[in-house]
């Protein structure tokens, strides 16, 4: 659920880290209504996810570690 590059809601799916190539953070105080993580998938889709959810935090942690180790 995204409009003019802003997420308006969150996916109700759980995505696997092997399906994700990267992410962007959306902050509510920077012109969008809600905080969100925008996952970029191997199918070239952008998926809006709830940054408070367990699986979302796990993937963000995983990808952040990868970037640090590069």
């Amino acid at each position: 659920a995204s409009n003019f590059d802003c997420c308006l809601g969150y996916t109700d799916r759980i995505l696997h880290p092997k399906f994700i190539v990267g992410f962007t953070r959306q902050l509510a105080n920077e012109g969008c209504d809600i905080n969100a993580i925008i996952f970029h998938t191997k199918k070239k889709l952008s998926v809006c996810a709830n940054p408070k959810q367990t699986w979302v935090k796990y993937i963000v942690r995983l990808l952040s570690k990868k970037v640090k180790n590069m």
């Epitope: 995505l15 959810q53 367990t54």
Partner: antibody
Amino acid sequence: QVQLQQSGAELVRPGASVTLSCKASGYTFTDYEMHWVKQTPVHGLEWIGAIDPETTSTAYNQKFKGKATLTADKSSSTAYMELRSLTSEDSAVYYCTKCYYGSADYAMDYWGQGTSVTVSS
Amino acid sequence: DIQMTQSPASLSASVGETVTITCGASENIYGALNWYQRKQGKSPQLLIYGATNLADGMSSRFSGSGSGRQYSLKISSLHPDDVATYYCQNVLSTPWTFGGGTKLEIK
């Protein structure tokens, strides 16, 4: 050690509702999603849905939307699944399972003992 | 939804033999595949996760392989204790889906 203790067997009438419980112990309940799986001789194992106890966010298999409702109570580390408008098709063993995260993988690493639901008049 | 096709549906082998169960996905699942063992009257148990990783406490006689759409589970030096139904599971994206199961019997 991790344990998922499920409620006892249920015999229910067609059209009725039933709520199954799953009490977690041995780990931090809010750190992992709880998933529910249906087992029948005909369809084998079917994923019903999951709940994140921290946020109460849910994910459902479209097939079970309107049939199952997942909830969780942080204070008692218990997950619940309500099944409504029961028919003989809902007769099955239902499992709660903890979701494992690690080495960039997801899996159901601990399972409850299962709750048998029989729908019969 | 991603469909998982498991074969064979049942199989009978002798103690000491090596058997292979295969699982095909309707699309690429990038190794997001698990295997479970369900013994009669018991809850399923995680056997292999991430296509190739052996779960804690499971025998090293079990091994998983595959990528893309095709995966397999190999059981070497079959034991009577291996009698069970084995399921593959796609976890790429919900709804997570299971294969139909393979019932393993000992001759």
